[in-house]
């Protein structure tokens, strides 16, 4: 009896794992084995596919074959008993195009109200993603174990921290990788669950801000209790994308180690030009807080986010404020190539009641003013990146009198 060729061959590639699956054509014939050949583009000869010779099952693994993953290959399969079937040719394919991203590895660290998620590719030193290893982004689904209500978080990097969680609560999550450059979405990791800890008696420091004084940076934060010591650590922001990098390590700022005040001062030359993350931890000698939320710190913005300059055109019932670039010493305007929002505070000269306007535009109308009344205005700039959270100091106050009642132009 002639053996029939196997049919419906499927090629599954996940990371560096190459799996072939096929259907037997004739279930009634026993003791049949299967063998594959492969052929590279531009070659005439077929080569035996190692790992897929004389297979008794309907699945084989050819991961050991060192292929150029960007090069098209063709496969063929036949059944063998005493005689052999004809070859069945599988459509040619490019491994990289066919490959799926496998489930990433996930490591969780619990705090009382936060979870730190460390994500790394499931296949270490993968050949398939060798050129794309640093381009992985991740997305995750997280839910409270008790409720099952899912929250999705997209476009995160290899280390991510989720805040505002409840203490002593079990959270579960799963993570998948994506290579946006190749339009590839990966397979979810197994579900990982972790219970947040009991609430820490010492809350983390809050409202961390950096300002510049002379040749120094001044780092300030708020804390609930007195008689504490604090330590500050920094990390290159770009390393969050790549914790595999041996440089990925939070480092101490020497002048901010075991400080007893809610601020520390350190020379500007501690940091080269760049973007950093900063975090602060409190200790009372016995207990230690969890780390604060991280703030982004851009040395360029930090050094040069100066208060805005502005002109006021006074009308009877309003001010028109025109905001310009701040001036450096030497009266040259500072070019600020990052988006800013402006906070404008104004008040009647004879009163302490302040009103506030927040605007993205550089021409702002302050409405509902009384005629022939002196109002004072001050302004400051904020960066629009919530992580950067940087503000200039306020400008000096400028006071102007509104026009008499009949002017509106």
């Amino acid at each position: 009896k002639n053996l029939k060729s196997p049919q419906k061959v499927e090629v599954d590639i996940i990371d560096d794992n190459f799996i072939l699956r096929w259907n037997r054509s004739d279930e009634s014939v026993g003791n049949v084995t299967f063998s594959f050949d492969y052929q590279k583009t531009g070659m005439d000869n077929w080569i035996k596919l190692s790992g897929c010779q004389n297979i008794t099952s309907t699945k084989c693994n050819f991961s050991s074959l060192k292929l150029n993953v960007y090069e098209e290959i063709k496969l063929r399969i036949r059944a063998e008993k005493e005689n052999t079937s004809s070859w069945y040719e599988v459509d040619s394919f490019t491994p990289f195009r066919k490959a799926q991203i496998g489930p990433p590895e996930v490591h969780l660290e619990a705090e009382d109200k936060a979870i730190v998620i460390h994500i790394s590719p499931g296949t270490k030193d993968s050949v398939m993603w060798a050129l794309d290893g640093l381009s992985f982004t991740y997305s995750l689904v997280i839910w409270k174990n008790s409720s099952g209500v899912e929250e999705r978080i997209e476009n995160i990097y290899s280390r991510h921290k989720i805040y505002k969680l409840s203490p002593e609560t079990t959270y579960c999550l799963k993570v998948k990788a994506a290579l946006l450059t190749s339009w590839k979405i990966g397979v979810y990791s197994p579900v990982h669950c972790i219970k947040t800890t009991v609430e820490n008696e010492l809350p983390p420091p809050e409202n961390i801000e950096v300002s510049v004084q002379n040749q120094n940076y001044v780092l300030k934060w708020d804390y609930t209790y007195a008689n504490m010591t604090f330590q500050v650590q920094w990390l290159h922001a770009f390393l969050k994308r790549n914790p595999g990098n041996h440089l990925y390590k939070w480092k101490q700022i020497p002048d901010c180690e075991n400080v007893k005040t809610t601020q520390c001062v350190f020379p500007q030359n501690v940091f080269q030009k760049g973007i950093y993350l900063l975090r602060v931890q409190a200790s009372d000698g016995n207990n230690t807080s969890f780390w604060s939320e991280e703030i982004k710190f851009d040395t360029e913005i930090q050094a040069f986010l100066l208060p805005p300059v502005f002109n006021i055109r006074s009308l009877s019932d309003s001010f028109h404020i025109y905001i310009g670039a701040p001036k450096q010493s030497g009266n040259t305007p500072v070019i600020q190539d990052y988006p800013l929002i402006y906070e404008i505070i104004f008040w009647e000269n004879t009163s302490n009641a302040e009103r506030k306007i927040i605007e993205k535009k550089t021409d702002v109308t302050v409405p509902n003013l009384k005629p022939l009344t002196v109002y004072c205005v001050k302004a400051r700039a904020h960066t629009m990146d919530e992580k950067l959270n940087k503000s200039s100091v306020f400008s000096d106050a400028v006071c102007e009198k509104t026009k008499p009642g009949n002017t509106s132009k």
């Epitope: 705090e111 730190v116 460390h118 595999g244 041996h246 390590k249 230690t288």
Partner: antibody
């Protein structure tokens, strides 16, 4: 697979120094803290300190700070622990043990241990 | 330094028994607790980290629980190979500290 292989047993006189080695394999050496723990005969476990093999940052148990030196040879993926001014109460098995990833926010448990090196201090 | 107090210090039990070992810390350690098993002449072996997470390859009869200052290791049904000394260890604050150990013996 992860392996930590330590140097052989040592016999030392009081006042002398001993240097124990721990050769790591099967993982990225510079990505994990390496810890040292000792165990006196019939006693419990005592943490000595740890080192970051990537930049040699160290943390010590205050009890050993003045007498212990931790060093690294990245070319051979080996960590060394030297204990000086030995006394009879330093007689113990000394273990190296892998700690958490250096990129973790917090410390981690000791997941792989060397086989131990018996150091005997006797006059 | 954080003190770790393990109890009992020794325990006799039979194969098939359910056994519980407790560990108390002098300060809250926020689940940064590990359990190790040590057999004579061998290095300790990590069983559980993070107070509750079973290491891969460790039989499921071992489980960890607890939070704050109080933690427990449970062996649901003792097997002959489980007779050993068990240590807890905190890794919340340096210096890391261990309990004094619980010797589990055959009754």
């Amino acid at each position: 697979q992860v392996q930590l292989v330590q140097s052989g047993a040592e016999v030392k006189k009081p006042g002398a120094s001993v240097k124990v080695s721990c050769k790591a394999s099967g993982y990225t050496f510079t990505s994990y803290w390496m810890n040292w723990v000792r165990q006196a005969p019939g006693q419990g476990l005592e943490w000595i300190g740890k080192i970051d093999p990537s930049d040699s940052e160290t943390h010590f148990n205050q009890k050993f700070r003045d007498r212990v030196t931790l060093t690294v040879d990245k070319s051979t993926s080996t960590v060394y622990m030297e204990l000086s001014s030995l006394r009879s109460e330093d007689t113990a098995v000394y273990y190296c043990a892998r700690g958490g990833r250096i990129s973790f926010d917090y410390d981690a448990a000791l997941d792989y241990w060397g086989q131990g090196t018996l150091v005997t201090v006797s006059s | 330094d954080i003190q770790m107090t393990q109890s009992p210090s020794s325990l006799s039990a039979s194969v098939g028994d359910r056994v519980t070992i407790t560990c108390k810390s002098s300060e809250v350690i926020y689940n940064r607790l590990a359990w190790y098993q040590q057999k004579p002449g061998n290095a300790p072996k990590l069983l559980i980290s993070g107070a509750t997470t079973l290491e891969s390859g460790v039989p499921s009869r071992f489980s960890g629980s607890g939070s704050g200052k109080d933690y427990t290791l449970t062996i649901s049904s003792l097997q002959p190979e489980d007779f050993a000394t068990y240590y807890c260890q905190q890794y919340w604050n340096k210096p890391f500290t261990f309990g004094q150990g619980t010797k589990l013996e055959i009754k």
